[in-house]
């Protein structure tokens, strides 16, 4: 009666660069096995309610399950299995011929690693710093990875960076995002989004630092030349960035089509899915290419805007051309025009 609900059940997700998504492999008495998506009487193209794999995501130290279904690029290891009974049960499994097995994929949300170090360097005036300079992005509680207030540490001195809106600093921002391994600069965050306000539940050591920095060279190519120490300002903005590597990205899916590679586009906001409304800034196929790629389908065949004659049609709106640039979705409560996209099906 083995199932993925059992406390000692072992699973892992492989063939991706994240422990929280990939091809599902399970450990049974004779080793690791890839699970075929045809298990439990399902068709190899069937998508399931992902929350059924909640325990797997939880034990992998990941977030909520986002998708459970075919992992379209199948890498077949030594052993693959088809299981029978209820979804998630591994009591009755048989070895499958590798060429008959389409692997089962699971994607769990990868929570943001935004927790600052548990102890920050204590403020000090002497000796002069010797440790290599480093940056840190501090997101608000529950905020995004690669988005937040920039803190600069030089040796034992650390603090935020004073920023004036008129500063011409595009090169610097790209350099900082890159240094943080967060891609390129997308935009400045207002302090409400960046989370400058102190969270009342925040432990003492995460509170504002007594040092502050000012930009001294916006074309710097090494961190030690970018900033100079100043007396902390009681007011004024601090540098807060959104970089292209932000997580979590907007997740999308296609619903109501004849296969997983076509349908009306929906996006995920928290735990809810809703229609993605058409946007004049996304009239090219770039947005839909991205959506097709996320479904692990081929390139876009066609897309059409469905008429929104209904004033009560609601959905979510992304103001950018690509969903990958969208770190926030806006609610549209009327005249939401849905978009029906058809992607090439890699397994017609």
């Amino acid at each position: 009666r083995l199932s993925w609900y059992d406390p000692d059940f072992q699973a892992r997700l492989t063939r991706s660069n994240s422990k929280c998504q990939g091809q599902l492999e399970v450990y049974l008495k004779d080793g690791w096995h890839m699970v075929c998506s045809q298990s439990w009487g399902r068709s190899s193209k069937q998508w399931e309610d992902p929350s059924q794999a909640s325990k797997v995501c939880q034990r992998l130290n990941c977030g909520v399950p986002l998708s459970l279904g075919p992992f379209l690029v199948t890498y077949t290891p030594q052993s693959s299995i088809i299981c029978y009974g209820q979804l998630g049960s591994f009591s009755n499994c048989s070895h499958s011929r590798n060429d008959m097995c389409h692997s089962l994929g699971l994607t769990c949300l990868e929570p943001q690693k935004t927790t600052p170090p548990t102890t920050r360097p204590p403020p000090t005036t002497t000796p002069e710093p010797t440790a290599p300079p480093r940056l840190q992005l501090v997101a608000q509680s529950g905020g995004q990875h690669c988005a937040g207030v920039v803190e600069f540490y030089s040796g034992s001195l650390g603090g935020t960076i004073s920023y004036e809106a008129q500063d011409k600093t595009q090169d610097l921002e790209n350099f900082l995002c890159n240094n943080l391994q967060c891609g390129s600069f997308l935009k400045h965050l207002p302090e409400t989004e960046a989370g400058r306000a102190q969270d009342p539940g925040e432990p003492r050591e995460h509170q504002p630092l007594p040092i502050q920095w000012k930009i001294q060279n916006s074309s710097c190519t090494s961190l030690e030349h970018c900033f100079r120490k100043i007396k902390p300002q009681k007011s004024g903005r601090v540098l807060a960035l959104l970089c292209s590597g932000f997580q979590p990205k907007v997740q999308s899916r296609l619903v109501g089509g004849s296969s997983i590679c076509e349908g009306t586009v929906e996006v995920r906001q928290g735990a809810q899915w809703a229609a993605l409304c058409d946007s004049s800034s996304a009239r090219s196929s770039l947005r839909w290419e991205e959506v097709c790629r996320e479904q692990q389908c081929g390139s876009v065949n066609s897309y059409r805007v469905l008429d929104a004659g209904d004033p009560t049609s609601r959905g979510l709106f992304c103001p950018h051309q690509k969903l990958s640039q969208c770190h926030e979705l806006w609610e549209r409560n009327s005249y939401c025009k849905k978009v029906f996209v058809t992607c090439q099906d890699p397994n017609p």
Epitope: S51, S54, Q58, C62, G142, G270
Partner: nanobody, 122 residues
Framework: EVQVVESGGGLVQAGGSLRLSCAAS????????MYWYRQAPGKAREMVAA???????YYEDSVMGRFTIFRENAKNTVYLQMNSLKPEDTAVYYC????????????????WGQGTQVTVSA
């Protein structure tokens, strides 16, 4: 902080019925799934039934057709309706919930209740 509280256990004769309730409170905006486990004396804890945020259910083979799990979303409450009870159903029944904090963007954590005793006499 999340709290999970079970109720409804008791003593019942074989063939009888009981309904267990489990209420989750606190930071429960993002419940991914809720479960009933049970542990009989000297045995390992086993999962009896599960219900997900998408409404899917799962039952352990020995209770299929006799037990029903259902939920009341507005109250973050899940129920286990147990019919045709057998002496081998005697155990402490625990409610378990997988919940993600930070408005669904945090890690999934599991939360357990204290358990409620179900005794089925022959």
């Amino acid at each position: 902080e999340v709290q999970v509280v079970e109720s409804g256990g008791g003593l019942v004769q074989a063939g009888g019925s009981l309904r267990l309730s489990c209420a989750a409170s606190g930071d429960t905006i993002c419940i991914s799934a809720m479960y009933w486990y049970r542990q009989a004396p000297g045995k390992a804890r086993e999962m009896v039934a599960a219900i997900t945020s998408g409404g899917s259910t799962y039952y352990e083979d020995s209770v299929m057709g006799r037990f029903t799990i259902f939920r009341e979303n507005a109250k973050n409450t899940v129920y286990l309706q147990m019919n045709s009870l057998k002496p081998e159903d005697t155990a402490v029944y625990y409610c378990n919930a997988d919940i993600a904090g930070h408005n669904c963007s945090g890690y999934l954590k599991e939360y357990w209740g204290q358990g409620t005793q179900v005794t089925v006499s022959a």
